[in-house]
């Protein structure tokens, strides 16, 4: 169960793994998510009632029962990791913390014009984890505009103190914003020298590379394969660093593989999970449970669903015993990696998918699309719904998208004049409006949740949730679309489609067959130029051809702007407003869904 709410003035008792310093409870939650064992945390905010040495402490916790007793304590903020909130997982943190000095090892001190320049310097410096910048108002004249680049063993501050007129923040490497670039090459039969920052066991060099990418101090790695001459070093992944940031030397070495961290790549990070299966391989570790399972795929599902499980080994059934079910060993360790890897014993091993953004119904592959057509085929957009009103007569009102088994995301402006959810019907799995008859099954709407800052479509916050009276059973023709990940804010989507039954020109009628149009995204700067009389905010996203011709129109409102990225469809926008339809140099304006992910989660998870 994904729980994103933070519990104010609440402390979880016991279960401590370790204490780190974080500038906010929100960032404490991210640190907990990426820690191999952390399930819950307690953060202490600054408060006159609390000892200043405890301010900004983030206590990472674990519990066999996945929960801990709650105690009231002023200034304490507690919560759960995002390990089961697939679309929430992102290491990217663009927040700037005012009047906080995040302490670490200062290794570079220089003058910068602004905090943004300082953050860019940190992002483009291979060793930098975070920075502190003394602003123009800093009391010490000589220290004004000084940008301090910092690093630590853990990647988090060693301490955080209040300090007027400074700002601090983190490197944006994990937001794919570093200009350092990266080496994607894997070097066979080559070993790097330099300092080892950690040693873990991995089944292959690719898992080794992912672990290196997410380790705060790993810049490159060397992996010793399972046929390496020294038995005790087989499957060893050495995470490495150097002062220069690159290996100072390398040695040709049979059965070793070396490579680099992908943290500085100008693309989103590899997912913090390993989806492959390793045949004839046993992973050793602390045993969590032994369960019967039909296949190694089923075993991986069991591991993924058990939040404390980190990896597993499946031993297939011998002959026909136990109804053909094998044994599924769910395991964990202190660092998330096996304590030993054995070969030749017949097991099939793998890792939990709980930290993949892929572990979700919304990522299931759907039918291949018909390129070039404007009419959709059945099952092509299984998240698209048609929202009908029954008053005064039944008609199509707006589009919408399935985002959960009881939730539709749509536009707030669709509900102008709608007095009650009782008059609404949601039809899913529909291709043609003509399929909707008196006896066609639909979902009643229990609740309409409109964003409380919504006034009109043109001023933003044009977003609404419909809570359905019954749950949607996912099939090929009705299933959810993934919400965009906050970590993918910098992704440039190139395969975006708008769909709906709306008008095909300004004076028209609702279409019978679901229409689709591939439309390029337009930058907000470009969009602002086309709508001088409006404010195009970062909470809006625009799409359209300069010459016009393809666009959403009346009746498409509330429907999805769906973009495919890494083979997964994401709900990037909600059809909101525009000047006319498909006019030259008038792009369509959509609600920028990534900016509302927190709002969506807050509303859909409210108890």
């Amino acid at each position: 169960e994904c729980v994103t709410q933070l519990l104010k003035d609440t402390c979880f008792e016991g279960g401590d793994i370790t204490t780190v310093f974080t500038p906010s409870a929100k960032y404490c939650q991210v640190v907990c998510t990426y820690h191999p064992r952390c399930l819950l945390f307690t953060f202490t905010a600054e408060s006159p009632s609390e000892d200043p040495t405890r301010w900004f402490t983030c206590v990472l916790k674990d519990s066999v029962t996945e929960t801990l007793p709650r105690v009231n304590r002023t200034a304490a903020i507690s919560g759960y990791s995002f390990k089961q909130c697939s679309h929430q997982i992102s290491a990217c943190n663009k927040d700037i913390y005012v009047d906080l000095d995040m302490k670490g090892i200062n290794y570079n001190s220089s003058v910068a014009k602004s905090a943004q320049e300082c953050q860019e310097r940190c992002t483009d410096d291979v060793h930098c984890h975070f920075f502190t910048y003394a602003t123009r108002q800093f009391p010490s004249l000589e220290h004004r505009n000084i940008c301090l680049l910092k690093h630590t063993q853990t990647g988090t501050p060693t301490r955080i103190t209040k300090l007027d007129k400074v700002v601090s923040g983190f490197s944006l490497k994990s937001c794919a914003l570093s200009n350092l670039g990266c080496h994607m090459n894997i070097f066979q039969h080559l070993a790097f020298s330099d300092v080892d920052v950690a040693r873990v066991l991995t089944p292959d060099a690719f898992v080794c590379r992912t672990i290196c990418t997410y380790h705060p101090n790993c810049l490159f790695f060397t992996f010793y394969t399972n046929v390496w001459k020294i038995e005790s070093q087989r499957n060893v992944c050495l995470l490495k660093t150097s002062e220069s940031g690159t290996p100072s030397s390398s040695t040709p070495q049979e059965n070793t593989i070396s490579g680099y961290s992908l943290l500085t790549c100008k693309r989103t990070l590899p997912e913090f999970c390993h989806s492959s299966f390793y045949h004839d391989t046993d992973f050793l570790g602390e045993e969590l449970d032994i369960v019967a399972a039909k296949s190694h795929e089923a075993c991986q599902k069991l591991c993924t669903n058990a939040v404390r499980c980190q990896f597993f080994t499946y031993t297939p059934a011998q002959a026909s015993c136990n109804e053909g079910k094998g044994k599924c060993y769910l395991k964990l360790s202190s660092n998330g990696s096996p304590t030993k890897i054995l070969h030749g014993r017949g097991g099939i091993s793998g890792y939990t998918l709980r930290l993949c953004k892929m572990d979700n119904e919304c990522t299931t592959k759907i039918k291949p699309r018909i390129v070039g057509g404007t009419a959709s085929v059945r099952g092509e957009w299984p998240w698209q719904v048609t929202l009908h009103t029954t008053s005064p007569t039944q008609r199509h009102l707006c589009g919408g998208s399935i985002i959960g088994n009881q939730w539709i995301l749509t536009a707030a402006h669709c509900f102008y004049g709608v007095e009650s959810p009782k008059i609404l019907r949601v039809y899913s799995g529909i291709l043609n409006q003509s399929e909707i008859k008196e006896d066609t099954s639909f979902f009643g709407v229990q609740e309409i949740i409109i964003h409380d800052q919504y006034k009109m479509a043109e001023s933003g916050y044009d977003i609404a949730l419909l809570k359905l009276e019954t749950t949607v059973n996912y099939t090929d023709s009705q299933r959810p679309i993934c919400l965009p990940s906050k970590g993918d804010r910098n992704v440039i989507y190139t395969d975006c489609w708008v769909t709906g039954w709306g008008y095909r020109k300004l004076r028209d009628k609702i279409q019978n067959t679901l229409q689709k149009a591939k439309i390029p995204l337009v930058t907000n700067e470009e969009c602002q130029k086309r709508y001088r009389g409006h404010k195009i905010t970062h909470k809006m996203i625009c799409a359209g051809y300069r010459e016009g011709g393809k666009d959403a129109c009346k009746g498409d409102s509330g429907g999805p702007l769906s973009c495919k990225h890494n083979e997964v469809w994401h709900l990037v926008g909600i059809t909101s407003w525009g000047e006319g339809c498909a006019q030259r140099e008038r792009p369509g304006v959509y609600t920028n869904v990534v900016e509302y992910v927190d709002w969506i989660l807050e509303k859909t998870q409210a108890v």
């Epitope: 200062n106 290794y107 001190s109 220089s110 800093f138 009391p139 010490s140 004249l141 000589e142 301090l148």
Partner: antibody, heavy 116, light 107 residues
């Protein structure tokens, strides 16, 4: 952990020059400024000068013409050079690490006696 | 150059007393003033920086206040181990400068 250690000649004849080395560990000289401060016997503290993380220097106005501060980042060493020494330069010489202009870590100091 | 003046070279106190040491700058130094404690045969130790921020591990009986040219360092309840020399220092503008020091002694 953070440490600073001064090493100097101990005794110098008048009109000679002085060279004191401050060797640091537990942090990098590229990220912190280092100060030199002296304290004559039974007297107060006198600020001599500093070298910033980026290599810039600042000196006490009265001593500027006789002072020179430099460093070797790779060796984690900071150097204080002072010429034309007089007996009133007899003092304990400290190096200290910068924290926004204050000095959060100090060395133990090295005693210099200027005497013939 | 900025001159820092500590008007009292000596101050007498008893354990448990509240004591305040003052320091005056010859020109405005904003809030960039630090306070140090020095015991015989030891290096100075940073207690307070930027007027009122306590350094790590410094007991909360030590506080600082002021801005501009007038600054005060206070020990709310003097302990035996607090008997030492206290220096103020401006870190507003180089060349940085120290006050002459105030020796806190037993009454």
């Amino acid at each position: 952990q953070v440490q600073l250690e001064e090493s100097g000649p101990g005794l110098v004849a008048p009109s000679q020059s002085l060279s004191i080395t401050c060797t640091v560990s537990g942090f990098s000289l590229t990220g912190y400024g280092i100060y030199w401060v002296r304290q004559p016997p039974g007297k107060g503290l006198e600020w001599l000068g500093m070298i910033w993380g980026d290599g810039r220097t600042d000196y006490n106005s009265a001593l500027k013409s006789r002072l020179s501060i430099s460093k070797d980042n790779s060796k984690s060493q900071v150097f204080l050079k002072m010429n034309s020494l007089q007996t009133d330069d007899t003092a304990r010489y400290y190096c200290a690490r910068d924290y926004y202009g204050s000095k959060d870590y100090w060395g133990q100091g090295t005693t210099l006696t200027v005497s013939s | 150059d900025i001159v820092m003046t500590q008007s009292h070279k000596f101050m007498s106190t008893s354990v448990g007393d509240r004591v305040s040491i003052t320091c005056k700058a010859s020109q405005d130094v904003s809030t960039a003033v630090a306070w140090y404690q020095q015991k015989p045969g030891q290096s100075p130790k940073l207690l307070i920086y930027l007027t009122s921020y306590r350094n790590t591990g410094v007991p909360d009986r030590f506080t600082g206040s002021g801005s501009g040219t007038d600054f005060t360092f206070t020990i709310s309840s003097v302990q035996a181990e607090d008997l030492a020399v206290y220096y103020c220092q401006q870190h507003y503008k180089t060349p940085y400068s120290f006050g002459g020091g105030t020796k806190l002694e037993r009454l």
